[in-house]
Interface confidence: medium
């Protein structure tokens, strides 16, 4: 005869384990169903009743089949500086990330909690380590022999255009410029840039100098001025 | 380097004020994120209040709601604690720390409610 | 009462492999935020010493490690030194509380 099919609630042989999507209730000592993903255990099983599910209340959710009394609360709303990348449904949690131009500083497992304005280098600095979805832009001084005229997350330190002959020497912020109609040869045509991140947060290592010896990250940023740059004449 | 001087700290009997500041240098102040931490004689850290970068919002722990206010003068790079009806519990070294990771510390100022 | 909770004291041989638990809730560490923890030596101010569940500040020794898992985290400080008696704190932010939240605090003795 074809081994019975157990129906919930039911007490399991003695060192085998409850099937898929069921759980082993300690007080009941039954093996007892979960419930689904959206729902959550209203009423716990008993040795003659099995689990009792009811769907998430709005702003809850879970993932997973469960045995939850309560559902799990949805995040708090996407702010201005952020993209809801996923809804909160009874099923998921809500996801936010950064919008471009912004970093994670404070990063939850999915997604981000609060976001940051990538640093500007100010004229006199480039940039020496792009920001990411989770770090900050990092900025240098342009050492001799290169400039940056921008105030900019992008824009890195330039050579100086060579010049036949020099009217104006260069320095960090402003390029040579040159008493002949053109260069002999122009190592600058036009401005580097690095390429934006989505999102994310600081690194706290400083590989290279830096105006400001800490990165900035911070916490919920209402959409609002930009920050000051990040820059030679400092705080 | 990062450096933050708090200020303002003394004695104060419960129910008084006390005002404390912290000056910052050493980084863009006005783009950071800034929070005062305190800890009561022999005791744990405890977070007390985060200011925006632009001072548009701030968070408070429950125990100092409606009696303590966080500001900031970003043209003077000093971050404010503005503490009234002050009680015994809240003696403490108050530190004001930069960034969600509290990443930056100050020396702390002792404020002590007493009568 | 601290949210995040952590064995008040630990101690250690120098030399020695210490590790430091910290344990949080679903509105914390298992919201899925990161753990930071924060060294203080007697007399001064904390110091960040970990970030992000297991990132060093630079100047921060590879002695020191972090990790975390579900609702717990822990700070494992290997080849113990006598310089790193102090207290540990682990915090992480807390959604119900909107704010950053603090260990109790752990004392770690070297013997």
């Known amino acids: 005869l074809p081994a019975q099919v157990a129906f919930t609630p039911y007490a399991p042989e003695p060192g085998s384990t409850c099937r898929l999507r069921e759980y082993y209730d300690q007080t009941a000592q039954m093996c007892c169903s979960k419930c689904s993903p959206g729902q959550h255990a209203k009423v716990f099983c008993t040795k003659t009743s099995d689990t009792v599910c009811d769907s998430c209340e709005d702003s809850t959710y879970t993932q997973l089949w469960n045995w939850v009394p309560e559902c799990l609360s949805c995040g708090s709303r996407c702010s201005s500086d952020q993209v809801e990348t996923q809804a909160c449904t009874r099923e998921q949690n809500r996801i936010c990330t950064c919008r471009p131009g912004w970093y994670c500083a404070l990063s939850k497992q999915e997604g981000c909690r609060l976001c940051a304005p990538l640093r500007k280098c100010r004229p006199g600095f480039g940039v020496a380590r792009p920001g990411t979805e989770t770090s900050d832009v990092v900025c240098k001084p342009c050492a001799p022999g290169t400039f940056s005229n921008t105030t900019s997350s992008t824009d890195i330190c330039r050579p100086h255009q060579i010049c036949n002959v020099v009217a104006i020497p260069g320095n960090a912020s402003m390029d040579a410029v040159c008493t002949s109609t053109s260069p002999t040869r122009s190592m600058a045509p036009g401005a580097v840039h690095l390429p934006q991140p989505v999102s994310t947060r600081s690194q706290h290592t400083q590989p290279t100098p830096e105006p400001s010896t800490a990165p900035s990250t911070s916490f919920l940023l209402p959409m609002g001025p930009s920050p000051p740059a990040e820059g030679s004449t400092g705080d | 380097e990062v450096q933050l001087l708090e200020s303002g700290g003394g004695l104060v009997q419960p129910g008084g004020s006390l005002r404390l500041s912290c000056a910052a240098s050493g980084f863009t102040f006005s783009s950071n994120y800034m929070s005062w931490v305190r800890q009561a004689p022999g005791k744990g850290l405890e977070w007390v209040a985060l200011i925006w970068y632009d001072g548009s919002n701030k968070y408070y722990a429950d125990s100092v709601k409606g009696r303590f206010t966080i500001s900031r003068d970003n043209s003077k790079n000093t971050l404010y604690l503005q503490m009234n009806s002050l009680r015994a519990e809240d003696t403490a070294v108050y530190y004001c720390?930069?960034?969600?990771?509290?990443?930056?510390w100050g020396q702390g100022t002792l404020v002590t409610v007493s009568s | 009462q601290s949210v995040l909770t952590q064995p008040p004291s630990a101690s250690g041989t120098p030399g020695q492999r210490v590790t430091i638990s910290c344990t949080g809730r679903s509105s914390n560490i298992g919201a899925g935020y990161d753990v930071h923890w924060y060294q203080q030596l007697p007399g001064t101010a904390p110091k960040l010493l970990i970030y992000d569940n297991n990132k060093r500040p630079s100047g921060v020794p590879d002695r020191f490690s972090g990790s975390k898992s579900g609702t717990s985290a822990s700070l494992a400080i290997s080849g113990l030194r006598s310089e790193d008696e102090a207290d540990y704190y682990c915090a992480a932010w807390d959604d119900s509380l909107n704010g950053p939240v603090f260990g109790g605090g752990t004392k770690l003795t070297v013997l």
């Open positions: 720390a930069k960034d969600p990771l509290f990443d930056s």
